[in-house]
Amino acid sequence: SGVFQLQLQEFINERGVLASGRPCEPGCRTFFRVCLKHFQAVVSPGPCTFGTVSTPVLGTNSFAVRDDSSGGGRNPLQLPFNFTWPGTFSLIIEAWHAPGDDLRPEALPPDALISKIAIQGSLAVGQNWLLDEQTSTLTRLRYSYRVICSDNYYGDNCSRLCKKRNDHFGHYVCQPDGNLSCLPGWTGEYCQQPICLSGCHEQNGYCSKPAECLCRPGWQGRLCNECIPHNGCRHGTCSTPWQCTCDEGWGGLFCDQDLNYCTHHSPCKNGATCSNSGQRSYTCTCRPGYTGVDCELELSECDSNPCRNGGSCKDQEDGYHCLCPPGYYGLHCEHSTLSCADSPCFNGGSCRERNQGANYACECPPNFTGSNCEKKVDRCTSNPCANGGQCLNRGPSRMCRCRPGFTGTYCELHVSDCARNPCAHGGTCHDLENGLMCTCPAGFSGRRCEVRTSIDACASSPCFNRATCYTDLSTDTFVCNCPYGFVGSRCEFPVGLP
């Protein structure tokens, strides 16, 4: 679809005569008829296959034709066509004299023709005008012409329909050849696909407008390249959506179980060494001078009773100092000025002379120690009990009283709640996260299977001869107490009396 445009510029008819040579009266009132048709080697009359157009009277005899784009068959003349432009044409331009106001062909005498020109040739679609001038014996016509495509038609022959659009069926303008030229930010055959934010993940992200990055389910982040872990995942990551791969030191479905309490919580104080010993459990190894589950308690240096021979210990900022009793001296009152004659051995210790009486040694009875047997043996000074256990002196030995959940000579072992066999009457113990549960055998109930619910073993009256029946709760059996003169488990046998 396009338009053949003809721009009339100047018509010269100086003598004001018709084609027949007869002059016009009073002058030649000139209008034009244009016929556009298919290419003919010799242009002949016949149907104007590409269209016709007529002008009103444009002037008398000789005149220039002004540009007039107001339409209505003015200048330039428009000959629209609704087909593919073939690239060739034939053009006939006739100048006619109008004696009256009726310009219809049938209203004019045949000799009203002033001049007739016919041209043919090739014509490509384009914006440039071709200038031409045709001269006859008495007239001259100057004009120009071109073929342009109608709005929204493109290509060498105006055959390609293309309408710019900016909606979801396309975001483009039209190139001169009719191909689409996508607006910035759009791509695809019809420029309908937005170009997402640079780096937006191809599979996990998408967009509905340019420079956007919307994430598909399971993905997050500016570029939709970060997976979303399982809901509730605490200390874990994912490589695909809804995973929960635990960070080092964490376990469980949601990675919320602490397997590295030492690192995450640093519970041991005062430079103690921490050792993980299970989920949320740990052991602190204290540096000298500290004690407590978390080595939080500072030991006095006098706590180790360094002063001998009854010396009294005084704490000082840089250590301790021993105040020695009469007859002793030295850093720890370890040197004596006494002899066995001074009866230096306490608590029943026996004295032995040494170095020809210049010195002595005490041999202490059990449970006493020191140079003079002055100290009761304290086997707890080395704080041997782990996990907050309490050390107790028991004569010549010591013993650790453990905190709940720990056992062993030194409370070094973690025990389950079931280790104490808390379930009575043969109940089965199950360790739970927060305590224990007993599964009781038939006949018993209660949190620890301590409640008897079975039928009394004496209910069937198993004892004979008026014997008294007793139930043994521990064995769920009966015992018969026989009257005088009867024996047997049920008192069923009489005994011969003397």
Partner: antibody, heavy 121, light 106 residues
């Protein structure tokens, strides 16, 4: 050959939500060449475009219905759906689903057979 | 909002040419589609992008669109062409239908 089939309740009470599903057979709803639309026609009246959706989930709605309409797509089931909330008697119509082709400038070359939805208490 | 206007009815004798118009502001700058709908049936696309015919649509259906008016022309109209005809265009991202024209073949 691609076929479209609407399904859903034929009767909806006023103020409730109208829900319809269009099942596409004989072709993939995930094609980048089409939008999938809903059009309705009240009894004895003309056609009214409701909205459409692309396989990516991008939606476009008629401004006059936008506040009440939701169109969604389920590529795994080859279906797309229409929800129209707060319905009144004026929403009584035959509801069509259609395929709108990019190659046809947005023309709808395939239509479902339509389903009549009546809004009445 | 954008509107498309069609005449409510057009009558034509069999074998004659029927023309149905559709007018809208600068409609010629948009692509027009035409649908045929017979009673109790779904619409059928007969013209898209102003003048193109989908496969299976007879050659007697043609279309044009310029200025403010799109026209559907049915040459050599047959009784089977009696139906409602709807024009449709896109205004930005919204589909717009004309009110429909009832074509009666006398």
């Amino acid at each position: 050959e691609v076929q479209l089939q609407e399904s859903g309740p034929g009767l909806v009470k006023p103020s409730e939500t109208l829900s319809l599903t269009c099942t596409v057979s004989g072709g993939s709803i995930s094609s980048s060449s089409y939008y999938w639309g809903w059009i309705r026609q009240p009894p004895g009246k003309g056609l009214e475009w409701i909205g459409d959706i692309y396989y990516t989930g991008s939606t476009y709605y008629n401004p006059s219905l936008k506040s009440r309409v939701t169109i969604s797509v389920d590529t795994s089931k080859n279906q797309f759906s229409l929800k129209l909330s707060s319905v009144t008697a004026a929403d009584t119509a035959v509801y069509y689903c259609a395929r709108q082709a990019l190659a046809l400038g947005g023309g709808s070359d395939k239509w479902g057979q339509g389903t009549l939805v009546t809004v009445s208490s | 909002s954008y509107e498309l206007t069609q005449p409510p009815s057009v009558s034509v004798s069999p074998g004659q040419t029927a023309s149905i118009t559709c007018s809208g502001q600068r409609l010629g700058d948009k692509y027009a589609s035409w649908y045929q709908q017979k009673p109790g049936q779904s619409p059928v696309l007969v013209i898209y992008e102003d003048s193109k015919r989908p496969s299976g649509i007879p050659e007697r259906f043609s279309g044009s669109n310029s200025g403010d008016t799109a026209t559907l022309t049915i040459s050599g109209t047959q009784p089977m062409d009696e139906a409602d005809y709807y024009c449709q265009a896109w205004d930005r991202d919204t589909g717009v239908f004309g009110g429909g024209t009832k074509l009666t073949v006398l």
